[in-house]
């Protein structure tokens, strides 16, 4: 059985989001804006 | 100063398969970038197809590109797209871009046509 | 998935004038939103990201807006230059399908 709890959508709690990482100077060598932590 | 350029694009059968490749130049891939593909039809919108990490290899797909589309990192300054089953819905300027910035390449176009 | 819905499609200004681009998700993506610039031909520039940040060397004219599920991008003080096709994307999750586009505005500069 599947113990982990589920909203009511479905997805799993806890399933922490991957944002695409921004580069806002963008053709120079930089590094990317930082993830949010967000669950 | 960094670039990327797509190259692989041309004409191509229905039900055909075809590489993209991106290359960076003024830097390379190692260091963990997010490297996407886009594509925009003939006088219609942007459509984002996934992305991938270049550190980790993991790769991320819109849901109509899963199963159809292949991201793969294949060296330091190149990443690939491979399309299978090809459709006259395919046909398009495919761009690669370094994650969320300005940095896209020009574009190489897909004709997907008997 | 993340539907962008962006209106109007196309909109008509006067030079000095002011347009207004709605671009509204169909979840929350916080502020993970950007908008991006096209001519014809050439790939897509990034003007702003995080919904309000502009991006370097990008004209103060140009202005982003709003949190959660509504945004806009305001120009003002149109220029012939800024007559192209504006997108907006979220970025709120590459794992989840949430990476689409907005369908698009053309601006025409009168």
């Known amino acids: 059985s599947y113990s982990m709890e589920h909203f009511r959508w479905g997805k799993p709690v806890g399933k922490k989001r991957r944002p695409v990482k921004v580069y806002p100077n963008g053709a120079e060598d930089e590094s990317a804006e930082a993830f949010p932590l967000e669950f | 100063q960094q670039q990327l350029e797509e190259s692989g694009g041309g004409l191509v059968k229905p039900g055909g398969t075809l590489t993209l490749t991106c290359k960076a130049s003024g830097f390379s891939f190692s260091s963990g970038y997010d490297i996407c593909w886009a594509r925009q039809g003939p006088g219609k919108g942007l459509e984002w197809i996934g992305c991938i990490d270049t550190g980790s290899g993991n790769t991320y797909y819109a849901s109509w590109a899963k199963g159809r589309f292949t991201i793969s990192r294949t060296s330091s300054t190149t990443v690939t797209l491979q399309m299978t089953s090809l459709t006259a819905a395919d046909t398009a300027t495919y761009f690669c871009?370094?994650?969320?910035?300005?940095?896209w390449g020009p574009g190489t176009l897909v004709t997907v046509s008997s | 998935d993340i539907v962008m819905t962006q209106t109007p499609a196309s909109v008509s200004e006067p030079v000095g004038g002011t347009v207004t681009i709605k671009c509204q998700a169909s979840q929350t993506i916080s502020s993970d939103l950007a908008w991006y610039q096209q001519k014809p031909g050439q790939p897509p520039k990034l003007l702003i990201y995080?919904?309000?940040k502009l991006t370097s060397g990008v004209s103060s004219r140009f202005k982003g807006g709003g949190t959660g599920t509504q945004f806009t991008l305001t120009i003002s003080d149109l220029e012939c230059a800024d007559a192209a096709t504006y997108y907006c994307q979220t970025y709120y999750d590459i794992s989840d399908d949430g990476c689409t586009f907005g369908g698009g505005t053309e601006v025409v500069v009168k």
């Open positions: 995080a919904a309000s």
């Open positions: 871009a370094k994650g969320i910035s300005s940095l």
